[in-house]
């Protein structure tokens, strides 16, 4: 079992453990091995203490266990004789946050270890580009996050503050939308969402490329490159090419780095190069028609980044077509 946890050591038999919502965690506690071991794990709030898990007379005792911990806790029973009193905690909820004390008594020692459990969540955010009538918007969205994240915007690498923030979920986890009006701008934008508890940061970057003017029946090359500053070599990512039309997005191609599979939804679409180095995801669109005019969006996304590149393509009638009319 993979348990994601961060251990922070603080003085006086106290540890801070950070877990993730819905995942499992181990609350550590150790003692010098001894006979006739008694273990009591308790949760302490401002008013009360609740029994989480007990062990004595050689077995786990759950008669007095608080109902919120039912079927969610266990000890490493065959390791108790070696001094391991750690608690295995399943399916963390935000309500599990708080102070846990582990009392261990043996014939020769009596100790208490304190564990401060903090629970965080950070579902991968998204950056979306939307057109509403004549306005263009960038939206940074995180569906589930706790605690409240730090959201920052930059325009051409300079921090900006004017964004519209919407939040739902009064106690957490929170769902947050941060929207920026970018109508008429040719700047590049960056949105960063940071969960300081989980030490996790996500960055969304949006770049508008110069408009491309092409003639009917020609082909167009749409550039989209993965920037090494953003992606580490072993990181899984996906690439989606789509077209924006009247505020609606339709997918043209989809690539998954883990399987190296590409799915094309438009037969005239193809990669510019072979995807050997997995960094250049430029596209060719052949046999252009007037209806191909519009905005083309390349989205490269991983758990840590989203890179959006926008191309505006203007397809003009060829001379022959014009003279035919």
């Amino acid at each position: 079992i993979f348990l994601s946890a961060f251990f922070t050591y603080v003085p006086m038999n106290e540890q801070i453990i950070i877990g993730r919502l819905g995942e499992d965690i181990i609350l550590p506690s150790s003692f010098e091995r001894g006979s006739e071991v008694v273990i009591h794990w308790k949760y302490q709030d401002s008013y009360n203490s609740y029994n989480v898990h007990s062990y004595y007379k050689g077995s786990g005792r759950l008669e007095s266990q608080d109902t919120r911990y039912a079927n969610r806790t266990s000890l490493f029973y065959n390791e108790i004789q070696n001094g391991n009193a750690s608690l295995f905690f399943r399916r963390l909820s935000l309500l599990d946050e708080g102070i846990y004390t582990c009392y261990v008594g043996t014939a020769i020692q009596a100790i208490t270890n304190k564990v401060v459990l903090k629970v965080g969540v950070f579902l991968t955010p998204m950056m979306k580009y939307e057109k509403r009538n004549t306005n263009s918007f960038l939206i940074c969205n995180v569906l589930s996050v706790y605690p409240r994240p730090i959201i920052t915007w930059k325009m051409d690498n300079t921090p900006i503050s004017e964004n519209n923030m919407q939040e739902t979920g009064s106690l957490g986890p929170f769902s947050i939308n941060s929207t920026l009006n970018i109508t008429g701008s040719n700047s590049s934008y960056e949105c960063t969402i940071e969960n300081s508890l989980l030490k996790q940061t996500w960055t969304g970057r949006w770049t508008m490329k110069d408009g491309l003017h092409k003639m009917q029946s020609e082909h167009v090359s749409l550039s989209c490159e993965l920037v090494n500053d953003y992606f580490s070599p072993n990181q899984d990512f996906k690439v989606t090419w789509s077209r924006m039309e009247s505020g609606i997005s339709s997918i043209l191609a989809y690539y998954l780095s883990s399987s190296q599979n590409t799915t094309f939804y438009e037969s005239r679409f193809s990669w510019n190069k072979e995807l050997k180095n997995q960094s250049d995801f430029s596209m060719n669109l052949t046999d252009l028609s007037l209806s191909d005019s519009g905005e083309y969006l390349c989205n490269i996304s991983s758990d840590e980044y989203t890179l959006l590149t926008i191309h505006t393509v203007h397809v003009e009638p060829s001379q022959e077509t014009a003279s035919d009319n």
């Epitope: 038999n13 008694v38 008594g105 014939a107 020769i108 020692q109 009596a110 270890n113």
Partner: antibody
Framework: QEQLQQPGTELVKPGASVKISCKAS????????MHWVKLTPGQGLEWMGT????????SYNQKFKGKATLTADKSSSTAYMQLSSLTSEDSAVYYC?????????WGQGTTLTVSS | DIVMTQSHKFLSTSVGDRVSITCKAS??????VAWYQQKPGQSPKLLIY???TRHTGVSDRFTGSGSGTDFTLTISSVQAEDLALYYC?????????FGGGTKLEIK
């Protein structure tokens, strides 16, 4: 032969602090927890707290948190309990006792008198 | 906290008698109870732990019994040297609590 030696008496003024010692011999000091117990005619025996000299892990009775501070010096096999901001309520016999959850060897006790 | 109550502050008995000292826990402590004897001018001595296990060197005249919340220390044939204060203690969880003590007097 396991033994715990404590000073017989301590006389201190109200508001002052006192550090009571408990010197262990005849066993491996760092392997056993050392407890401190208060005896008064009114309250009987009260467990104050414990220290495990092996890693200096301490546990206190909430009632004595802030009043008592437990320490241990492995090099001299001595446990200490410091009592601060003394009042007449702190006048009592204080025992150190060795053990885990039960106490198999006790010191002779230190009679603390708080008086001006 | 798990509080221990010894209902009898004093018990009067004669040499050779069988006497039982009782102790009640405020909640279930399984068998995690110890008994101590304190003679006048001395420090307490451990007699029994885990409700019924005799400590090294303790006379077999002393027997402990009970589980859950009710516990008993029995002296099968009281001797003059048994004149003392007897305390029970729960060793199930911290803070450890002692009973108020029962003083055994010899008639």
């Amino acid at each position: 032969q396991e033994q715990l030696q404590q000073p017989g008496t301590e006389l201190v003024k109200p508001g002052a602090s006192v550090k009571i010692s408990c010197k262990a011999s005849g066993y491996t000091f760092s392997s056993y927890s050392m407890h401190w117990v208060k005896l008064t005619p009114g309250q009987g025996l009260e467990w104050m707290g414990t220290i495990y000299p092996g890693n200096e892990n301490t546990s206190y009775n909430q009632k004595f948190k802030g009043k008592a501070t437990l320490t241990a010096d492995k090099s001299s096999s001595t446990a200490y309990m410091q009592l601060s901001s003394l009042t007449s309520e702190d006048s009592a016999v204080y025992y150190c006792a060795r053990g885990g959850y039960y106490f198999d060897y006790w010191g002779q006790g230190t009679t603390l008198t708080v008086s001006s | 906290d798990i509080v221990m109550t010894q209902s009898h502050k004093f018990l009067s008995t004669s040499v050779g008698d069988r006497v039982s000292i009782t102790c009640k826990a405020s909640q279930d402590v399984s068998t995690a109870v110890a008994w101590y004897q304190q003679k006048p001018g001395q420090s307490p001595k451990l007699l029994i732990y885990w409700a019924s296990t005799r400590h090294t060197g303790v006379s077999d005249r002393f027997t402990g019994s009970g589980s859950g919340t009710d516990f008993t220390l029995t002296i099968s044939s009281v001797q003059a040297e048994d004149l003392a204060l007897y305390y029970c203690q729960q060793h199930f969880d911290i803070p450890y609590w002692f009973g108020g003590g029962t003083k055994l007097e010899i008639k």
